[in-house]
């Protein structure tokens, strides 16, 4: 029996990320006897729920059950039946639901109530549905990428498990972009913070981390676009908005009621002499960039240094992983390579935005027009946010790594959330006993 493998005791966990634009279900697995080790949990499945984010179901809550069915059934298939009852299920809702809660706490609770009712019908061990805070979203994203990069492991390796790993224990900062909010989280050089609201302290695997984090509500890519449109329509002379952030020849009618539906546009709201207006694309990166910059108030800063809107931001430190929409957008634009300089990215964006809409549609025939039409804005917004918002420079640009997956697991807050809620990140370094990790007898 020298090399006979013992049957491994595998555990599973499910986290639903209820984002502003869509919901994704993630299934994680890990060997039960190693659950306090770093880097042993990995993602086995991502299931994207068909339809919009859960906050859009506020007037049709009875449809939430059907909406979640396919992905929950997929989880039933992937996870062995013998493990169903033991498998924890968590749902975390992010900025889309934060915005709904700002409008009506009662309506937000109604949505979560129906979510619980729906998820309780499955054989898994449902733990709860809640709206996570922006601070949590930032912190858990930071934990996820550093866990997957092996930054919490005390064992130094002579080899690199992932391309970005520099084989040191310096943690990566986390840059997360969603539809309705964006988060920046990193360990600054200076341990003292001028803004306690932005300070988090962790003890993970026997080491203390003083982390800076901030979540900018309304500065996710979709809400930023609504903000920009609401700002620009204020000065339009008629119901035509010539917009540099859309390709030349692109046309779209927008309802003013849709524009002012979100709390994110309240500061730009005014009575307009029309109910609808038409966006006409003119495809000019430079003008689009200027328009986006007007969303960032940099004139006021009560600290030594700010990002924008008077929010403290310490000097940037170390490497950063940029994930979620930072990655999806830059990957679509083919700009995720480490070799592409910031100047080159800007150059490519200028070229992309100026391409006629008809040409774009032909080149990307398989892409939904709604998404396709917004890549010029989204790419420009990402550049503006990183450079002017967070003060990255042409030099520090090379410290940004656009990451989709690490070791097969998606970068994002969900893994960190599950690790925390299942107590799988010990404060102290676990003592490894000689036989505790033996799989062979």
């Amino acid at each position: 029996t020298q090399n006979k493998a013992l049957p491994e005791n595998i555990k599973y966990g499910i986290v639903l990320d209820a984002g502003s634009s869509h919901t994704s279900l993630y299934i994680y697995k890990w060997p039960a006897e190693k659950e306090n080790d770093t880097g042993v949990v990995h993602q086995v499945e991502e299931c994207r729920v068909k339809g919009p984010g859960i906050s859009k179901y506020v007037q049709k809550v009875n449809e939430i059950g059907i909406y979640l069915t396919d992905c929950m059934e997929r989880a039933r298939e992937v996870i062995p039946r013998s493990q169903h009852q033991e498998t924890p299920v968590y749902l975390g809702a992010t900025a889309g639901m934060r915005l709904l809660r700002m409008e009506s706490e009662e309506l937000a609770d109604r949505v979560l109530d129906v979510v619980e009712r729906s998820l309780s019908n499955y054989p898994f061990d449902f733990q709860g549905a809640r709206i996570i805070t922006g601070q949590e979203e930032g912190a858990y994203g930071w934990i996820t990428i550093n866990y997957l990069l092996g930054k919490f492991s005390q064992k130094t390796r002579w080899f690199s498990i992932v391309p970005y790993e520099t084989n040191n224990q310096e943690t990566f900062g986390a840059l997360d972009l969603g539809g309705a909010s964006t988060q920046i989280t990193f360990v600054p050089q200076n341990q003292t913070t001028e803004s306690p609201d932005n300070a988090l302290q962790f003890r993970l695997y026997g080491k203390d981390y003083n982390v800076y984090t901030h979540s900018f509500l309304c500065y996710g890519k979709d809400q930023a676009l609504w903000q920009k449109l609401a700002k620009d329509i204020q000065v339009a002379s008629n119901e035509i908005l010539r917009d540099p952030c859309f390709h030349p020849g692109y046309k779209k009618v927008v309802n003013v009621s849709d524009l002012y539906k979100t709390p994110c546009t309240k500061r730009f709201e005014m009575t307009l002499p029309f109910q609808q207006f038409e966006i006409q694309g003119i495809g000019n990166y430079q003008q689009c960039h200027q328009s986006v910059l007007e969303l960032f108030n940099t004139s006021y800063c009560p600290y030594s240094q700010c990002a924008f809107n008077g929010i403290f931001l310490p000097p940037l430190q170390g490497d950063f992983g940029a994930f979620s929409a930072f990655y999806f957008v830059m990957n679509f634009l083919n700009l995720t390579s480490e070799k592409v300089s910031q100047e080159k990215v800007t150059e490519m964006m200028k070229k992309f935005c100026s391409q006629p809409w008809e040409e774009i549609k032909t080149s990307y025939a398989g892409v939904k027009e709604k998404y396709l039409s917004e890549y010029c804005f989204s790419g420009t917004y990402i550049l503006s946010l990183l450079l002017q918002g967070y003060h990255f420079t042409a030099d520090s640009w090379e410290h940004i790594h656009f990451i989709g997956k690490i070791q097969g697991s998606d970068a994002g807050w969900t893994l960190g959330y599950m690790l925390n809620l299942t107590n799988m990140i010990p404060a102290e370094q676990p003592l490894s006993t000689p036989l505790s990790h033996s799989t062979y007898v």
Partner: nanobody, 126 residues
């Protein structure tokens, strides 16, 4: 951390009814599964019932099934235990408990991080 305050205990005759309340302050109430445990004189702590954050999942100990009902009112940040057909063996100190993002099933196993109330005495006697 949440704080819990039980009320409604007292002396009741066998076959009678009693309704316990547990008011929760601090924290977002719907994020907590709530539970009732009890401790009879000279005995260990016993699970009675638990309910999920929005009330769709409940668990009961076999000894109270069909007689006790747990419910919650999230607008009042309160969980209730309706006790009917009370018996002498239901005499105990009843403790309210809260666990954040933890299933009622795990509360039943006393797993996870649980916050406890100070308890309310229920005496069933003729």
């Amino acid at each position: 951390e949440v704080q819990l305050l039980e009320s409604g205990g007292g002396l009741v005759q066998p076959g009678g009814s009693l309704r316990l309340s547990c008011a929760v302050s601090r924290g977002t109430f719907s994020e907590y599964s709530m539970s009732w445990f009890r401790q009879a004189p000279g005995k260990g702590l016993e699970f009675v019932t638990a309910i999920s954050g929005f009330g769709h999942i409940t668990h009961y100990a076999d000894s109270v099934k069909g007689r006790f009902t747990i419910s919650r009112d999230n607008s009042k940040n309160t969980v209730y235990l309706q006790m009917n057909s009370l018996r002498a063996e239901d005499t105990a100190v009843y403790y309210c408990a809260a666990a954040w993002q933890t299933s009622p099933r795990r509360m039943m196993q006393m797993a996870g991080s649980i916050t406890w109330g100070q308890g309310t005495q229920v005496t069933v006697s003729s």
